[in-house]
Amino acid sequence: VPRWRQQWSGPGTTKRFPETVLARCVKYTEIHPEMRHVDCQSVWDAFKGAFISKHPCNITEEDYQPLMKLGTQTVPCNKILLWSRIKDLAHQFTQVQRDMFTLEDTLLGYLADDLTWCGEFNTSKINYQSCPDWRKDCSNNPVSVFWKTVSRRFAEAACDVVHVMLNGSRSKIFDKNSTFGSVEVHNLQPEKVQTLEAWVIHGGREDSRDLCQDPTIKELESIISKRNIQFSCKNIYRPDKFLQCVKNPEDSSCTSEI
């Protein structure tokens, strides 16, 4: 008799999830000499241990501590780039500006980027059919808790000037409910972080508005200033030119406003 399986509202675990995590780990540790000591089988075992046989609505940050310990990594604390709703451009930027890092440029972020996973209570099976949706089912699901945990740690590690890339095409350029707005902003340490610099990325070619005047940006400014961190805001009117100028800063067209 087939066993009854909980039907969740979100997509199931990404196919070939264990193989993908293991392969990503091997690739990452080969490319990054400072992480060559990492045993990828142990990393997978710790990852698996965080959610296998556990109710997928009852995951805690503590479940991920063994994985966090194995994935401990030092990135230059003054070279951190946060992002919200504009992941692709943020990643394109750090691929060019190699001394800056998004969360997904770290081992743990790289392992989990764009993946979904969950298990089932009291069985060692991975659920490939469905996983809990953050809104419709529960917030303490394996994926959400993972990103909350690594995002908090990443923000806590930041120092000096922290940059954040925000999507100027969204109705809420700064969204209090995003990972950046709900986790990272509140875990920047005023004793270490002097300034948060927001880069508001424009979508339209002819969009010359000053999006730093947007009410949601002023809300971010208020939150940050109350935490005794300076706030800076810059419009990136031409993201294509912005990337080009990161690649070729000597280009004569790169002295004007981007």
Epitope: K192, D210, C212, Q213, E221, I224, Q230, F231
Partner: antibody, heavy 119, light 107 residues
Amino acid sequence: EVQLKQSGPGLMQPSQSLSITCTVSGFSLTSYGIHWLRQSPGKGLEWLGVIWRGGSTDYNAAFMSRLSITKDNSKSQVFFKMNSLQGDDTAIYYCAKGKVTTGFYFDFWGQGTTLTVSS
Amino acid sequence: DIQMTQSSSSFSVSLGDRVTITCKASEDIYNRLVWYQQKPGNAPGLLISGVTSLETGVPSRFSGSGSGKDYTLTITSLQTEDVATYYCQQYWSTPYTFGGGTKLEIK
């Protein structure tokens, strides 16, 4: 080019009110905060208060009861008013621009308004 | 309020000297420190922020260091145009406060 130009009186009597206007160019008051400071031989440099780009203000508690900072974004002007002047308010008064949007230190300063309080 | 103390109010120096100016806060200011240079008749000008970051156009003979409560401004080889008064300012907490200044004078 960023500039801050101050206008205001030079000599005032005790108990009078000091009013200084700081007119800025080269940037918008909706993008940066404007701070007010003063410098005297006796007390050195003192931070008095700030009006942030959104219009909210923070004042040095020692001056809060007699200080008011307002602005008119459309005219690029910031207005400083200090009541109940006494002899020890004799100083050079400066407006200054915050280095970043919400900056706690200053990259451009006005030329200064020299105030002497004397009867 | 946080008190900022610059121990020497004036220094007699020679051109080419290495000059060190110190600034001590009454409590930890977590690297929220800037240095200004002021010449007679002028407003102060921003020199260094965040303890070590030189402002655009500031010569590389200027450098800043320190942490916690203790901070230092160093001029490696004093030039004529460096003769001025130097102030530190903390921006960890309001009211933002300044040191009393250190005036450099030529011997």
